[in-house]
Amino acid sequence: MRRERGRQGDSSSCERQVDRVNLKPCEQHIMQRIMGEQEQYDSYDIRSTRSSDQQQRCCDELNEMENTQRCMCEALQQIMENQCDRLQDRQMVQQFKRELMNLPQQCNFRAPQRCDLDVSGGRC
């Protein structure tokens, strides 16, 4: 089907939606994946919840937002921002970013175009 793209939802609308949803399950799910269930990562009580459960909860939360590339991008950027200070080295940052980029697909959403995940002003 041919279509001419309309507006992607304005920034304030997406910001409100991202503020409203709980992104912690997404953050926990990605942390679990890159930490490999390591016991020392106990900033969250994540050991009692399997990664697949966290993933489902994460997808459910993302599903609460308007399904636009703009809002998905804002959510991913917020996750990156939230976890930035917890990522101990460059390798961990890259691992986290890789997993974050795969998140939309894992939840059966389209990965956002033009989405710059380097949002922390060089902090990450």
């Epitope: 089907m1 041919r2 279509r3 001419e4 793209r5 309309g6 507006r7 992607q8 304005d10 920034s11 703009r70 991008c73 804002e74 950027q77 980029m101 389209r110 990965a111 956002p112 175009q113 033009r114 989405c115 710059d116 995940l117 380097d118 949002v119």
Partner: antibody
Framework: EVQLVESGGGLVQPGGSLRLSCAAS????????MTWVRQAPGKGLEWVAN????????DYLDSVRGRFTISRDNAKNSLYLQMNSLRAEDTAVYYC????????????????WGQGTLVTVSS | QSVLTQPPSVSAAPGQKVTISCSGT????????VSWYQQLPGTAPKLLIF???KRPSGIPDRFSGSKSGSSATLGITGLQTGDEADYFC???????????FGGGTKLTVL
């Protein structure tokens, strides 16, 4: 070698129409977004329109939406810009550009440009 | 008037370093990738930097790009007279669903 060659520019009266063409060679045309960018005499660059690889998605500058139509023919390695209801402020050199935008987590960037074709709208 | 703000002109002596800023908002630079272009007099623009910091092959490492928040910067070191040109930044604006170019900066090598 990547080459983009525009044609179809010229002098047209306000309210008139023109169709710009861009012949692409030296790369797999069907795998790239394509973009028209214009530059009014002595002014800066202004993006006009984007078209996805398969032509299924198009984006336009607000001031040309409804008057201009971007299209492509991948079999002919050609990009087009149909310009209707032309105004004096559409006077510019129009560049055909290859856009490096990929499907996710990348930005628009214009890595190859044609030489440009001048469109003059005047009575 | 462009939504992306660049200084109209900058100048420096040969061999010196110069930076050109490009200021936007959260809906454009803040969320999206920035590219930079050089336009020599009477020629088509040429890509210098894409995805904030990457250089296409053939662009010398004297040219660099960075981004922080809603601003981006182009850096040029070891200035040469051949660098005299207009420089433009560009990015996508998610609110407008459009690519934006900065107004351009004229670089003069003294």
């Amino acid at each position: 070698e990547v080459q983009l060659v525009e044609s179809g520019g010229g002098l047209v009266q306000p309210g008139g129409s023109l169709r710009l063409s861009c012949a692409a060679s030296g790369f797999k045309f069907s795998t790239f977004y394509m973009t028209w960018v214009r530059q009014a005499p002595g002014k800066g660059l202004e993006w006009v329109a984007n078209i996805k690889q398969d032509g299924s998605e198009k984006d336009y500058l607000d001031s040309v939406r409804g008057r201009f139509t971007i299209s492509r023919d991948n079999a002919k390695n050609s990009l087009y810009l149909q310009m209707n209801s032309l105004r004096a402020e559409d006077t510019a050199v129009y560049y055909c550009t290859r856009n490096g935008l990929q499907d996710s987590y990348s930005g628009d960037f214009f890595d190859h440009w044609g030489q440009g074709t001048l469109v003059t709208v005047s009575s | 008037q462009s939504v992306l703000t660049q200084p109209p002109s900058v100048s420096a002596a040969p061999g010196q370093k110069v930076t050109i800023s490009c200021s936007g908002t959260g809906s454009n630079i803040g969320h999206n990738y920035v590219s930079w272009y050089q336009q020599l007099p009477g020629t088509a623009p040429k890509l210098l930097i894409f995805d904030n910091t990457k250089r296409p092959s053939g662009i010398p490492d004297r040219f660099s790009g960075s981004k922080s928040g809603s601003s981006a910067t182009l850096g040029i070191t070891g200035l040469q007279t051949g660098d005299e040109a207009d420089y433009f930044c560009a990015t996508w604006d998610a609110d407008l669903s459009a690519v934006l170019f900065g107004g351009g900066t004229k670089l003069t090598v003294l």
